[in-house]
């Protein structure tokens, strides 16, 4: 259960940091 | 929150102009803009933008022919020497994708 | 470069159909997601559709549905209606020293 919330969360994540770089323009981390 | 675009004219071939974006709502600390022009009857194409610490990015085919600059409340495009294929509709727009926010657009007419 | 490619075009629709608009991209869009749909209809700016391949943008109805991945994307309209009458743009997004986000050439859908 607790793979399944870690897994979730870092989709949450991923598609916020997506959106942040989309409003901002700045470069991806490596 | 919106954005305005203002400038657009009649100007003969080699005049260089420059186009305003203004932006209300929110700061350009916080976001990107972009340039998408639009030719009559034609598609969108996308020119470039500038980034939360000013730095500006081109379409390869823009290198050159546009410099994209910004001040705390307006972004700029400045076409440096224009030809009649310039003549376009010109759209700002908030962020370098997912563009959620755009301009009417100003139209510019380059003739001689 | 990356280069985005819309087919068909025109699309005919009748009321309460259905219209699939394809777009490919010529390499994967970055993180295989950065791809965005746009709505425009004369005399206006595009208008944000969907982003991230099938996210729904604020206040756009669920008859509109975004598919695929890396290089092939589909957006779906069901029920369409004759407010669904303008040309669709889709936008793929790379990064090389720079954001790249050009846009395909538009597919226009005509409502009957």
């Known amino acids: 259960r607790k793979n399944l919330q870690d897994f979730a969360a870092c989709g949450i994540d991923r598609m916020n940091y997506d959106s942040y770089l989309a409003q901002t323009g700045k470069s991806p981390a490596k | 929150q919106s954005v305005e675009e203002s400038g657009g004219r009649l100007v003969t071939p080699g005049t260089p102009l420059t186009l305003t974006c203004t932006v209300s709502?929110?700061?350009?600390?916080?976001?990107?803009m972009s340039w998408v022009r639009q030719a009559p009857g034609k598609g969108l194409d996308w020119i470039g933008y500038?980034?939360?610490?000013?730095g500006a990015y081109y379409a390869s085919w823009a290198k050159g022919r546009f410099t994209i600059s910004e001040t705390s409340t307006t972004v700029y495009l400045k076409v440096n020497s224009p030809t009649t294929e310039d003549t376009a509709t010109y759209f700002c727009?908030?962020?370098?994708?997912?563009?959620?926010?755009w301009g009417p657009g100003t139209l510019v007419t380059v003739s001689s | 470069a990356l280069v985005m490619t819309q087919t068909p075009s025109p699309v005919s629709a009748a009321v309460g159909g259905t219209v699939t608009i394809n777009c490919q991209s010529s390499?994967?869009?970055?993180?295989?997601?950065?791809l965005s749909w746009y709505q425009q209809k004369p005399g206006q700016p595009p208008k944000l559709l969907i982003y991230?391949?099938?996210t729904l943008a604020s206040g756009v109805p669920s008859r509109f549905k975004g598919s695929g991945s890396g290089t092939q994307f589909t957006l779906t309209i069901s029920g369409v209606q004759c407010d669904d009458a303008a040309t669709y743009y889709c936008?793929?997004?790379?990064?090389?020293?720079?954001?790249?986000?050009?846009f395909g050439g538009g597919t226009e859908v005509v409502v009957e």
């Open positions: 727009a908030r962020g370098v994708a997912n563009s959620d926010i």
């Open positions: 709502g929110f700061s350009l600390s916080r976001y990107a």
């Open positions: 500038i980034d939360i610490g000013g």
């Open positions: 390499q994967s869009v970055f993180n295989n997601k950065w």
């Open positions: 991230f391949v099938s």
């Open positions: 936008q793929g997004s790379d990064y090389s020293s720079g954001w790249y986000s050009p």
